[in-house]
């Protein structure tokens, strides 16, 4: 088909030779008034760059991608010729960086439903260059982690060395969808939830006297739980004395809260102190009684078949420990009066 009528967009991918990174192209189809295929709701031009990623609800996967060989050969179907490039719906994913990805990429609807659709195509001229300037030693990574339950931010790698004041207007996408309210080089997340993970794309425009182009970077964001910095705390028993009836059975429960750790080896045990002697008691297995994002509560009981006079002279100690440290809580039994 004739690509001379396609709208054209120039993009620059500057990749870091130090790290693995991916890149994406959206099928930014234009919006001729008469084309039902390309028609979609758009925000006002003030809010949005020249084109939006194609988001027609029924047509998400109904686009065809081609590469235009530099030698003037016919267009090549991406799926047949380039194993490191994957089409996912209307997005083209480049799995590995390299200057060999430079070239012209064309997308258009698979189904041409009307004569107007013939021109419903977009040509993206992609230039790929390795990052050369060492001036920005600490540029943001293309893989960024956010700590669940805390405040975090996602930085645009190609702009992370610029202050917010100097930074140009940035257009952000998350999993292919425009984040219309985000316009700076950093997205601030007040409280991180797992739905904040995904593929983020940041675009900004650069120009010289001749032309302008879009500088794009892709960030893979993961949400992770941070390891606790606290030793466990004992929630029960709270009191250090317990009223009991002699000759009756007794169960004392120790409930301890352990902060999340990726390598989780909680210790919870009972031991008895009697004058100078100390020994660990064989008690039923510990069991988890509550599990939340940031911690786990584990319970272990000590069971006395019948409380004796000797037990009143002893201290029953619950000992809990994680990789940070340990805590103990002792209980002295006291005979109930009356």
């Amino acid at each position: 088909f004739n690509i001379s009528g396609c709208s054209t967009k120039k993009l620059l991918w500057t990749y870091s030779t130090r790290s693995e990174e991916e890149f994406v192209l959206f099928c930014d189809l234009p919006e001729p008034q008469k084309s039902h295929f390309c028609h979609r709701n758009r925000l006002s031009p003030k809010q949005v760059p020249e084109h939006l990623p194609f988001m027609g609800s029924n047509d998400l996967s109904d686009v065809q991608w081609y590469q235009q060989p530099s030698n003037g050969d016919p267009l090549e179907d991406i799926r047949k010729s380039y194993p490191h490039i994957i089409q996912d719906k209307c997005t083209l994913h480049f799995l590995t960086p390299g200057v060999n990805n430079s070239g012209s990429y064309i997308c258009r609807p698979k189904m041409i439903k009307s004569p107007y659709d013939v021109a419903c195509c977009v040509k993206m001229i992609l230039e790929v260059k390795p990052q050369t300037n060492a001036s920005c030693e600490y540029s943001a990574s293309h893989k960024q982690d956010l700590l669940l339950g805390s405040t975090g931010s996602i930085s645009c790698p190609s702009l992370s060395c610029q202050s917010d004041a100097q930074s140009p207007a940035v257009t952000w996408y998350k999993n292919g969808k425009l984040l219309s309210v985000e316009r700076s080089n950093r997205i601030v997340v007040d409280e991180v939830y797992d739905y904040h993970q995904g593929t983020y794309v940041c675009d900004y425009t650069q120009s010289d006297t001749v032309s302008s182009w879009t500088v794009r970077a892709v960030v893979q964001v993961r949400t992770i739980v941070g390891d606790t910095k606290l030793k466990p705390d004992i929630l029960d028993p709270v009191e250090d004395t317990l009223e009991v009836e002699l000759g009756k059975p007794l169960t004392i429960s120790c409930k301890a809260r352990f902060g999340f750790e990726r390598v989780f080896n909680p210790v919870i045990k009972w031991y008895i102190k009697d004058s100078d002697l100390e020994w660990e008691v064989s008690v039923p297995e510990a069991k988890s009684i509550k599990s939340t994002l940031k911690d786990e509560i584990i319970e272990r009981n000590i069971i006395l078949e019948k409380v004796t006079q000797r037990d009143l002279r002893r201290k029953f100690v619950c000992f809990v420990q994680n990789s940070i440290g340990n805590t103990t809580q002792s209980v002295q039994l006291k005979e109930k009066r009356g």
């Epitope: 339950g149 939830y193 739905y195 599990s291 939340t292 319970e299």
Partner: antibody, heavy 114, light 111 residues
């Protein structure tokens, strides 16, 4: 999103497994719970699963089993009785607890009758 | 097991008025505040309104307010709208999750 399936008419004593299919969210760090509602009645908390551990309401112990894969959370009704006739909802607590269920499936109806 | 007792149903409210629903727990709630409030309309799943006893869930209008601590909690709806007609449930979380339970529900009728 969450979607329950597997609800149907069963005879008393016939085990039944309900499946909650999850898309677009990670199951590893947050509680995924099951709640039920008998026709015309209130909500009942069955239990939840988090980091592979399962927790059941006292009344539900032994009557239900919760398990999960990377994209589904199952609820097995071990030996249904007519009292188990209800709409069963799966829900997710994105706030890090076991009680603030902010994501819900539409529910699936289980009818136990002889 | 813990028991959560809610204001008996139904509770009437006038459009533009204020309505309060109480929820009392037989045991102390975990962290004193692990209690949530849900709104449910017929044929729909419940919708989270409040968690942590007083924190508004995402997208919930500020007309909904949760208060209380320990064993006594209240949901207050101010400037009541017709759309607020529904059944409201509290859900308590305890140190031992096996005690977790819903309250019996309170139906709010808007006149």
């Amino acid at each position: 999103s969450l979607e329950e399936s597997g609800g149907r008419l069963v005879t008393p004593g016939t085990p039944l497994t309900l499946t909650c299919t999850v898309s677009g969210i990670d199951l590893s760090s947050y509680a995924m719970g099951w709640v039920r509602q008998a026709p015309g009645k209130g909500l009942e908390y069955i239990g939840y699963i988090n980091r592979g551990n399962t927790y059941y309401a006292n009344w539900a112990k032994g009557r239900f089993t919760i398990s999960k894969t990377s994209t589904t959370v199952d609820l097995k009704i071990t030996s249904p009785t007519t009292e188990d006739t209800a709409t069963y909802f799966c829900a997710r607590d994105s706030y890090g607890g076991d009680y603030a269920f902010n994501l819900w499936g539409p529910g699936t109806l289980v009818t136990v009758s002889s | 097991a813990a028991v959560l007792t809610q204001t008996p149903s139904p509770v009437s409210a006038a459009v533009g008025g204020t309505v309060s629903i109480s929820c009392q727990s037989s045991k102390t709630i975990y962290n004193d505040n692990w209690l949530s409030w849900f709104q449910q309309k017929p044929g729909q799943p419940p919708k989270l309104l409040i968690y942590g006893a007083s924190t508004l869930a995402s997208g919930v209008p500020s007309r909904f307010k949760g208060s209380g601590s320990g064993t006594q909690f209240t949901l207050t709806i101010s400037d009541v709208q017709c759309d607020d007609a529904a059944t409201y449930y509290c859900l308590g979380s305890y140190i031992n999750s096996s005690d977790n339970a819903f309250g019996g529900g309170t139906e709010v009728v808007v006149k």
